[in-house]
Interface confidence: low
């Protein structure tokens, strides 16, 4: 069957297309090409007689068409009007006719797009920005890129106008980025230059650093204030409510206790019209800068479990300090049997249990220094059961009875394996 193949099917303006004929019959008299889906003398492009090898232009001939002996038709310098159907009419030697129709589409070569914006300096959480990809082009697809990646999914992003317009509602500082648009059609794709969105925001609540509250007399006080802001914030400092200076950093050398007070950093963004403040308390203290190592004194270091109590005392010559206790790296008190008294100087455990055995230490600290004691070991023993009351059956220890021990067993639910352990330990 006679068929026509267009190569390419989608043709760019200014390029060329070949209407390629397949299954051309043998013994031909000639053939003729027509614009459209049927044979119409008024729309004949060109005719060709094989015997004379003569090509004759028709009414629809534009001078851009070339016919080949195999009946294929080349059209050069394609224009938009060339889009559509083309019909080949074949006249065989027996004067029986055959027809076939092919088609192609013409698309413009796209120009480089550009982005227009309705707001070049949007304010965070307040403004919307609409980017429009120019120019408007028929049969083009529009795509958007943010920082060279496809658009993220967000309820604040909306595409409209056939994806030609990208709107960002309630812009945030995270929308500050590079935006590009791309136009595509079947024959070309072009990408715009970047537009950098500069979202104005802040200032956020300022942070005063360093975070220290306590200083020694004679130290230099150097405070820095920072608030995320675009454009950068203007800063000012107040001490105890009195304006000091308009700088981001405050420096006071050789401070004394008189420099104690409230330090306020004020951050202002003149473009967004917003301002924020943070207040920091500075205490210049005469506290000893180095806390001496404390010592632990124990009422006893070996005690009997479920019977004895013990008092541990953290001794220090420093004043104005606080004390905290640790046991096996855990902060105390950790049970109702443990009590702290005398401003945490004394740790009392009453009664002492098996699980209280281990290492204890105390730590003394003031706001600018701390030190800890050497550890002390508390041993917890249990009275061993008499040898004659224990018998060994399959590696288990049991009471044999006598001496009222069964009554004790019933009352105290002694754990045999523990009894066995202590028995072997002490005998």
């Amino acid at each position: 069957k006679l068929t026509i193949e267009s190569t390419p099917f989608n043709v760019a303006e200014g390029k060329e297309v070949l209407l390629l004929v397949h299954n051309l019959p043998q013994h031909l008299f000639g053939y003729s090409w027509y614009k459209g889906e049927r044979v119409d003398g008024n729309r004949q492009i060109i005719g060709y007689v094989i015997g004379t090898q003569q090509a004759t232009p028709g009414p629809a001939y534009s001078g851009r068409e070339i016919i080949y002996p195999n009946a294929s038709l080349l059209i050069q310098n394609i224009i938009q009007n060339d889009t559509g159907f083309y019909t080949l009419h074949v006249i065989k030697s027996d004067l029986v006719n055959e027809e076939a129709t092919g088609q192609f589409r013409v698309y413009p070569e796209l120009p480089k797009p550009s982005i227009s914006s309705n707001n070049s300096k949007p304010v965070e959480d307040k403004d919307a920005v609409a980017f429009t990809c120019e120019p408007e082009t028929q049969d083009a697809t529009y795509l958007w890129w943010v920082n060279n990646q496809s658009l993220p999914v967000s309820p604040r992003l909306q595409l409209s106008n056939g994806n030609r317009t990208l709107t960002l509602f309630n812009v945030t500082r995270n929308d500050s980025a590079s935006y590009k648009c791309e136009t595509q059609n079947p024959v070309s794709a072009r990408r715009s230059d970047s537009v950098i969105l500069n979202v104005l925001y802040g200032p956020d609540t300022p942070t005063i650093s360093p975070s220290d509250t306590y200083y020694r007399p004679g130290a230099n006080l150097s405070l820095s204030c920072y608030a995320a802001s675009n454009p950068p914030a203007q800063y000012s400092w107040l001490i105890n409510g009195t304006f000091q200076q308009s700088t981001q950093e405050l420096f006071i050398p050789n401070i004394t206790v008189n420099n104690s007070g409230s330090y306020t950093c004020h951050a202002n963004n003149s473009v967004t019209g917003c301002n924020r403040t943070t207040v920091k308390t500075i205490i210049v203290t005469e506290l000893s800068p180095v806390v001496a190592k404390p010592q632990i004194k124990a009422s006893k270091t070996t005690v009997t479990g479920d019977k004895d109590s013990v008092n541990l005392t953290c001794s220090t010559n420093d004043t104005g300090i606080s004390i905290r206790w640790f046991f096996k790296n855990q902060s105390l008190p950790s049970s109702e049997r443990m009590k702290l008294s005398q401003g945490n100087i004394t740790l009392s455990i009453n009664p002492v249990k098996r699980e209280d055995a281990g290492t204890y230490w105390c730590e003394v600290f003031n706001p600018i220094s701390k030190n800890q004691s050497d550890p002390i070991m508390l041993n917890v023993n249990y009275n061993a059961l008499p040898q004659e009351n224990l018998i060994n059956v399959d590696e288990q220890l049991y009471f044999q009875g006598g001496s009222g021990l069964n009554d004790i067993f019933e009352a105290q639910k002694i754990e045999w394996h523990e009894a066995r352990a202590h028995h072997h330990h002490h005998h």
Epitope: R173, S176, A177, S178, S194, V195, I196, N198, V199, P231
Partner: nanobody, 119 residues
Framework: EVQLVESGGGLVQPGGSLRLSCAAS????????IGWVRRAPGKEEELVAD????????RYADSVKGRFTISADTSKNTAYLQMNSLRAEDTAVYYC????????????WGQGTTVTVSS
């Protein structure tokens, strides 16, 4: 297309000076901020200085305060880094970068220019 082209690097003796330039195209430096970032072998990347030309705001790393000065000429769409009293530890590849936010640096970098401080 956004492009940043650095120049002005070279070999200089300790205590010497260099002036780096960053020529921007494809966007207007008035609409953003420009920073100089340096990368030295075995060291962390360091933001040396940045400037927001439309507001005149500048920031400097502690390591270069008092020695380096950042500036911008919006008519030439170019940023500069004047480096004085150079030290051996200033040896690095210096890159110009677009700062679209105060605290974030986008992936628009130049090709870099090498500064070597050595006697």
């Amino acid at each position: 297309e956004v492009q940043l082209v650095e120049s002005g690097g070279g070999l200089v003796q300790p205590g010497g000076s260099l002036r780096l330039s960053c020529a921007a195209s494809g966007f207007n430096i008035k609409d953003t901020c420009i920073g100089w970032v340096r990368r030295a072998p075995g060291k962390e990347e360091e933001l040396v200085a940045d400037i927001c030309p439309s507001y005149g705001g500048t920031r400097y790393a502690d390591s270069v305060k008092g020695r380096f000065t950042i500036s911008a000429d919006t008519s030439k769409n170019t940023a500069y880094l004047q480096m004085n009293s150079l030290r051996a530890e200033d040896t690095a590849v210096y890159y110009c970068a677009i700062v679209s936010k105060i605290d974030q640096y986008y992936n628009y970098w130049g090709q870099g220019t090498t500064v070597t401080v050595s006697s």
